[in-house]
Amino acid sequence: LQDLCSNCPAGTFCDNNRSQICSPCPPNSFSSAGGQRTCDICRQCKGVFKTRKECSSTSNAECDCISGYHCLGAECSMCEQDCKQGQELTKKGCKDCCFGTFNDQKRGICRPWTNCSLDGKSVLVNGTKERDVVCGPSPADLSPGASSATPPAPAREPGHSPQ
């Protein structure tokens, strides 16, 4: 009997109660490998889950999350809510980014604004909860005495062609 069962292909199960050994999986069930003694119940994508791929006799349904949620865990076993830009998801729900931090995505955590002065630059555009600061030229470059003229091109040595 074991040998006969191993001949049952995916999409069927080995039915010991019938003379025809390999029986097709009943509706809403599947077997993804051959030689199965039972078919598995198809996953149902309900509530915050939506169907990404329908169940077939040989493969389980695949779920996704409805708008406003994103998948977590193996095979999208959980749906975690999205937050708005300018927020981060905590264990107690979506919270606004603290001053000095931002999040430009619907998931993830708030990150500190770039410290422009560490690169010797100045803040060109202030940061918000949703956007990082934009760094501009260094403060020295913006001082009244600084020339904004284009510096002269370096002189070429005779006999050298331009790079």
């Epitope: 998801l89 905590t90 264990k91 107690k92 955590i109």
Partner: nanobody, 124 residues
């Protein structure tokens, strides 16, 4: 391979109790905080409780405070959730999760591994 396997779910009447277990393997259990979360059929993920690696710090969602107790037994590499005075709104799939550090937090998720879940149904 890091693995978390939940058990203990089932059907219980309102006011009843259940104890969920989560068997951990593939990592040093006492070195990491652990968390329980749940997902009801029509809702997104809801944090339930977190316990530190040492077991001395615990946090609970307001919705379960005073009714649920999280605990751990490092000799058995097992996390527990004792659920008392169960209500219909506690019906959900319960997942245990490993956090990335030993320190417990009631703010950030630091989860890097999830279990497959166990179903709790509270109904008369």
């Amino acid at each position: 391979e890091v693995q978390l396997v939940e058990s203990g779910g089932g059907l219980v009447q309102p006011g009843g109790s259940l104890r969920l277990s989560c068997a951990a393997s593939g990592f040093t259990f006492s070195s990491f905080a652990m968390t329980w979360v749940r997902q009801a059929p029509e809702k997104g993920l809801e944090w339930v409780s977190t316990i530190s690696g040492s077991g001395d710090t615990t946090y609970y969602a307001d919705s379960v405070k005073g009714r649920f107790t999280i605990s751990r037994d490092s000799s058995k590499n097992t996390l527990y959730l004792q659920m008392n005075s169960l209500r219909a709104e506690d019906s959900a799939v319960y997942f245990c999760a490993k956090e990335a550090t030993a320190m417990a937090s009631d703010y950030y998720y630091g989860v890097d591994v999830w279990g497959q879940g166990t179903t709790v149904t509270v109904s008369s």
